[in-house]
Interface confidence: medium
Amino acid sequence: QQQTLPKPFIWAEPHFMVPKEKQVTICCQGNYGAVEYQLHFEGSLFAVDRPKPPERINKVQFYIPDMNSRMAGQYSCIYRVGELWSEPSNLLDLVVTEMYDTPTLSVHPGPEVISGEKVTFYCRLDTATSMFLLLKEGRSSHVQRGYGKVQAEFPLGPVTTAHRGTYRCFGSYNNHAWSFPSEPVKLLVTGDIENTSLAPEDPTFPADTWGTYLLTTETGLQKDHALWDHTAQNLLR
């Protein structure tokens, strides 16, 4: 006899990285017929939803209208059908960004290099705790983690034209609180003359779907909706 139901799926829309004071929705998808969903935050009951009618709904949404550091952390959800409860979902790490300060990103030997050269990015932030994240714009949304007291090094090693693209970094105040993004640094890698035109470049999404930051006079550094790889989620594990 089955003791528990299969675990639900949990995710955040538009993204698990949420600029402070912006909205986010935590979604929990279980089974049709579930009469109750519970959202847990850092191990404690956070919210309850009872879908109506349960037989027509298999997903609930928990809306956070105003993200802040107190709401950042690990979420999970469970549901029940009748008296039978599900296994808990995987953990969702909800991260608040645009906290406090802005790091500086630089690249050595420079932003224009030749294929094969060794390139290192440096992310500096006086006030971060010790962890830094380097992100490359694009479909695969590469994320690297680095450590240092006020600066982290990100050695890319000998680069190829596949390393071309736009990079940004964040400083982390803790696992769930990240700084503003640095200003972008565009890395230009020149390959062999005959290969340059055919060099593969990490394909990027349009600006409105990649997690880039737009500079506007109205809001300063503003986070766009993003659908990043779950690589960044895994970094928090």
Partner: antibody, heavy 120, light 107 residues
């Protein structure tokens, strides 16, 4: 609406200490840095230091390290600045200001100032 | 420490005028330059951040420009409510430092 409400004027004797407050409202207190500044009569502003209320981390202007102590009470959304061993040079208006939401080291909301007069 | 210099300590202008206030840093501050307005009652407000970005709620007659070490604040079509002292502040390196201020008066 973001507001920073500072405590009232202080008249203190030389050698004494004073502790002033800055009550924040209209935003999540722990998510923004609070700065403190000094303005002597008819003069410019001097930056004293800043506190990260979420962690209690402080950064001070070297000039004020021995003079000012910054603290914050997360439960009441109040930042404090204590000034010690007061002299006539410390007579000034002291401002608290929130470092802005832009991440670009600008102070977007300011308190109304607390006037401190050091006199025997 | 980075020194911020506002060479003009006071300035007289007529209503409707275009007024420019300048600020010089002792070293390159990479556009981390902010402008504040202090009214006669002591109230301080942020006008411009990061050289040229207008803070929310600030009238569009205020604008900022500059780079490197030299920056300026421009007020177009001066109004009575603009009578105040204007301070620049660098946000490039701690300790954050302010200019001495430029007091704007009506002719």
């Amino acid at each position: 609406e973001v507001q920073l409400q500072q405590s009232g004027p202080e008249l203190v004797k030389p050698g004494a200490s004073v502790k002033m407050s800055c009550k924040a409202s209209g935003y999540t207190f722990t998510d923004y840095v609070i700065n403190w500044g000094k303005q002597r009569s008819g003069q410019g502003l001097e930056w004293i230091g800043e506190i990260y209320p979420g962690s209690g981390t402080n950064y001070y202007n070297e000039k004020f390290k021995a003079k000012a102590t910054l603290t914050a009470d997360k439960s009441s959304n109040i930042a404090y600045m204590q000034l010690s061993s007061l002299t006539s040079e410390d007579s000034a208006v002291y401002f608290c200001a929130r470092r802005g939401r832009y991440g670009l080291y600008a102070m977007d909301y300011w308190g109304q100032g607390t006037s401190v007069t050091v006199s025997s | 420490d980075i020194q911020m210099t506002q060479t003009t300590s006071s300035l007289s202008a007529s209503l409707g005028d275009r007024v420019t206030i300048s600020c010089r840093a002792s070293q390159d501050i990479s556009n981390y330059l902010n402008w504040y307005q202090q009214k006669p009652d002591g109230t301080v407000k942020l006008l411009i951040y990061y050289t040229s970005r207008l803070h929310s709620g600030v009238p569009s007659r205020f604008s900022g420009s500059g780079s490197g070490t030299d920056y300026s604040l421009t007020i177009n079509n001066l109004e009575q409510e603009d009578i105040a002292t204007y301070f620049c502040q660098q946000g490039n390196t701690r300790p954050w430092t302010f200019g001495g201020g430029t007091k704007l008066e009506i002719k």
